[in-house]
């Protein structure tokens, strides 16, 4: 039993890392592999990852940490029984991949502005709180080429646009990301997106 | 071994305080984050209180706010509750557990309210 | 803040029984959620994070799935030390919430 691709892990900087790697051949990860993590200080814990399988020989370990700081380091050990795999180290803070935003809602009660607004994935404390910037992506349902991003760099998690920049009488889909420029994070998954019917009263022609 | 120990429950009328201790053993106490949890009698767990290990940020749960107080002395390896304007429905046995997630619970303390 | 409703609140089964809980949270919360169980006078133990990960320790007739809103805790076979209380857990954001817990007993 071999390593083929060697573990590689993303945190989302405040509860979880999750570490991924595919074995030379079908494996039972649950079964016959354990992934150790051990917070580099003295006197630190070992903890014991049961990984899930991710396709016949890929493996995934969702690894539980205390509120990440961007000094934490990690050694990993893949073992498969008594038989050491594979060894490493993973430092959160050089490896971060977001939490997705939640809760977009698309307002349409403002004249001829939609206001988009969504929650901040992280608590106040927590350093990405202040440094998530965003992208949202706004698509017809009707018309697969009428799809824009929209880049999202100030802080405050919303968005105007106006209605007449999108098709009346159609429906659009919305979704929003997050990433951090300042720990050159990843984008986060994708939020769950929401549906609204555009409707916006032409403006009369001049002639 | 991880071992938590909570202490200072008791009898205590309604309006009054009470502080609860938790102290910690087997682990660095400082490098983790903690909680409080209670669960009134015969009923569900409730998620009371948070204090982080990295910025000493605290939450608490709405039942609570403005009421309770968390708060840590690492020198001591403690965890603390003081607990203010004491309600009959804050009667439960209150756990401390630490964080990640819950991953150890001391045995609780029983917090009565009643006059 | 995120309510986390748990059906059934009570269920009887037998030993050997396959025995589905579910839990429901009130917006989306990833996979930020945990299953705990509780004997009378017991302190509770997490079994699953994560959604689906099983704590170390914990025998393997016990999973978990689900994902976004809607969670399942499955017991395979029913072990006699399986009869006890089973709480969901939300840890997306703060305040953290329980679901009202689920009580497996004795058919």
């Known amino acids: 039993m071999k390593v083929l691709q060697e573990p590689t892990c993303v945190s989302d900087y405040m509860s979880i890392s999750t570490c991924e790697w595919k074995m030379n051949g079908p494996t039972n990860c649950s079964t016959e592999l354990r992934l150790l993590y051990q917070l580099v200080f003295l006197l630190s814990e070992a903890h014991t990852c049961i990984p899930e399988n991710n396709g016949g020989a890929g493996c995934v370990c969702h690894l539980l940490m205390d509120d990440v700081v961007s000094a934490d380091n990690y050694t990993l050990d893949l073992w498969a029984g008594q038989q050491l795999l594979w060894k490493g180290s993973f430092k959160p803070s050089r490896h971060v991949k977001p939490r997705a935003p939640g809760n977009l809602t698309v307002h349409t009660n403002v004249s001829d502005t939609l206001l988009l607004t969504w929650s901040n994935p992280y608590p106040p404390d927590n350093y990405l709180y202040n440094h998530l910037t965003y992208a949202v992506n706004i698509w017809s349902e009707n018309d697969p080429a009428d799809f824009r991003i929209y880049n999202v760099t100030y802080l405050e998690p919303s968005l105007r646009i106006a209605a007449s920049t999108l098709k009346s009488g159609i429906s659009y889909r919305a979704r929003v990301r997050a990433w951090a420029q300042c720990y050159n994070t990843t984008w986060s998954e994708w939020s769950p997106s929401t549906k609204w019917h555009n409707s916006y009263r032409e403006p009369f022609e001049q002639h | 071994q991880v071992q938590l120990v909570e202490s200072g429950g008791g009898l205590v009328q309604p309006g009054g305080s009470l502080r609860l201790s938790c102290v910690a053993s087997?682990?660095?106490?400082?490098?983790?984050?903690m909680n409080w949890v209670r669960q009134a009698p015969g009923k569900g767990l409730e998620w009371v209180s948070y204090?982080?290990?990295?910025?000493?940020?605290?939450y608490y749960a709405d039942s609570v706010k403005g009421r309770f107080t968390i708060s840590r002395d690492n020198a001591k390896n403690s965890l603390y509750l003081q607990m203010n304007s004491l309600r009959d429905e804050d009667t439960a046995v209150y756990y401390c557990a630490r964080e990640p997630v819950f991953d150890y619970w001391g045995q609780g303390t029983l917090v009565t309210v009643s006059s | 803040d995120i309510q986390m409703t748990q059906s059934p609140s009570a269920m009887s089964a037998s030993v050997g029984d396959r025995v589905t809980i579910t839990c429901r949270a009130s917006q989306d919360i990833s996979n930020y959620l945990a299953w705990f169980q509780q004997k009378p006078g017991k302190v509770p133990t997490r079994l699953i994070y994560?959604?689906?990960s099983l704590q170390s320790g914990v025998p393997s007739r016990f999973s978990g799935s689900g994902s976004g809103t809607e969670f399942t805790l499955t017991i395979s076979s029913l072990q006699p030390e399986d009869f006890a209380t089973y709480y969901c857990?939300?840890?997306?954001?703060?305040?953290?919430?329980f679901g009202q817990g689920t009580k497996v007993e004795i058919k």
């Open positions: 087997g682990f660095t106490f400082s490098h983790s984050s």
């Open positions: 857990l939300q840890w997306s954001s703060y305040p953290r919430t």
């Open positions: 204090i982080s290990r990295a910025t000493g940020a605290v």
């Open positions: 994560a959604a689906s």
